[in-house]
């Protein structure tokens, strides 16, 4: 069956300066390919985190994505600022040249509250 990307939270609220976790789990690791987090949709979407060797300031993975059976691709955003507000999507790709997007989570809206 086709892999599903599940983002259980519709929205999260976080105070500026605090950290928040955006949850994402997959039903399968197949087909082989990367998982990436984006803010927004379409051509203007912004890459927030990729479960690869790249480094992203203030964004970290919650569990060890290198473990073979791990299906949790949640991320933690630290020191949240008002500019971090928006809808975040966890997206599964199939490896190729280039990688092909095959499934997206439903999105989690991040609301940033004044401290």
């Amino acid at each position: 069956t086709e892999v599903k990307v599940i983002q259980p939270e519709k929205s999260v609220s976080v105070a500026a300066g605090d950290s928040t976790v955006l949850n994402c789990t997959l039903t399968s690791l197949l087909p082989v390919g990367p998982i990436r987090w984006y803010r927004g949709v379409g051509q203007s979407r912004q890459l927030i985190y990729s479960f690869t060797t790249e480094h992203f300031p203030r964004v970290t993975n919650v569990s060890d994505a290198t473990k073979r059976s791990n299906l949790d691709f949640s991320i933690r955003i630290s020191n949240v600022t008002p500019e971090d507000a928006g809808t975040y999507y966890c997206v599964k790709f199939q490896r190729g040249s280039p990688d092909t997007e095959i499934q997206s989570g439903g999105g989690t809206e991040v609301y940033v509250l004044a401290k």
Partner: antibody, heavy 119, light 108 residues
Framework: EVQLVESGGGVVQPGRSLRLSCAAS????????VNWVRQAPGKGLEWVSL????????YYADSVKGRFTISRDNSKNTLYLQMNSLRAEDTAVYYC????????????WGQGTLVTVSS | EIVLTQSPGTLSLSPGERATLTCRAS??????LAWYQQKPGQAPRLLIY???SRATGIPDRFSGSGSGTEFTLTISSLQSEDFAVYYC??????????FGGGTKVEIK
């Protein structure tokens, strides 16, 4: 106090149509996703359809896809369910249910309206 | 689609007794599970969400536990108003949202 009041139920012949309404009050209607959930006589709960606060996101149960249409009018604080090509198995009490703002569980329900499909 | 199976179908108990209701999921729903109570002729009422958090105004004799695929709703000491049908619902997966088949708690 949150209030959800359904109307529009009744007896209808198979193949005919019916439109249900749900009037909402006591909360900012446009900020919440709302659903229709039904319950056949003596049976359990069955989720029917969901519409997001803006109306942009819509889902249906496979059992009603292509026959039922969910919509909302945020200026009137009202949710609708247009039911076409009705079948005997659509006979049920139809509830409108307001979702929690963070998760897809239901923290408020209407009292329900009975739809009976019979010749 | 995630299937929820509730057991037993009917529970016959006396007031003051402890009721234990079970809900099993066909795959893990983590703690994204809610419980509802429904009395005859009434709409369902939210009791528990997040597997173990009581909804506003719900008495503390109701408690929920579990995670993953196995969940329990416990009523520590049944009151007359607790005799009803109880449903679990998962909200982990995006729609279709699914309910269990229900457990009827009746007076013995």
């Amino acid at each position: 106090e949150v209030q959800l009041v359904e109307s529009g139920g009744g007896v209808v012949q198979p193949g005919r149509s019916l439109r249900l309404s749900c009037a909402a009050s006591g909360f900012t209607f446009s900020s919440y996703d709302v659903n229709w959930v039904r319950q056949a006589p003596g049976k359990g709960l069955e989720w029917v359809s969901l519409i997001s606060g803006s109306g942009e996101i819509i889902y249906y149960a496979d059992s009603v896809k292509g026959r039922f249409t969910i919509s909302r009018d945020n200026s009137k604080n009202t949710l609708y369910l247009q039911m076409n090509s009705l079948r005997a198995e659509d006979t049920a009490v139809y509830y409108c249910a307001k979702e929690n703002n963070r998760y897809r569980f239901f923290d408020d329900w209407g009292q329900g309206t009975l739809v009976t499909v019979s010749s | 689609e995630i299937v929820l199976t509730q057991s037993p179908g009917t529970l016959s108990l006396s007031p003051g007794e402890r009721a234990t209701l079970t809900c099993r999921a066909s795959q893990s729903v983590y703690t994204y599970l809610a419980w509802y109570q429904q009395k005859p002729g009434q709409a369902p009422r939210l009791l528990i969400y997040g597997a173990s958090s009581r909804a506003t105004g719900i008495p503390d004799r109701f408690s929920g536990s579990g995670s993953g695929t196995e969940f329990t709703l416990t009523i520590s000491s049944l009151q007359s108003e607790d005799f009803a049908v109880y449903y679990c619902q998962q909200y982990y997966d995006r729609p279709p949202l699914t309910f269990g088949g229900g457990t009827k708690v009746e007076i013995k």
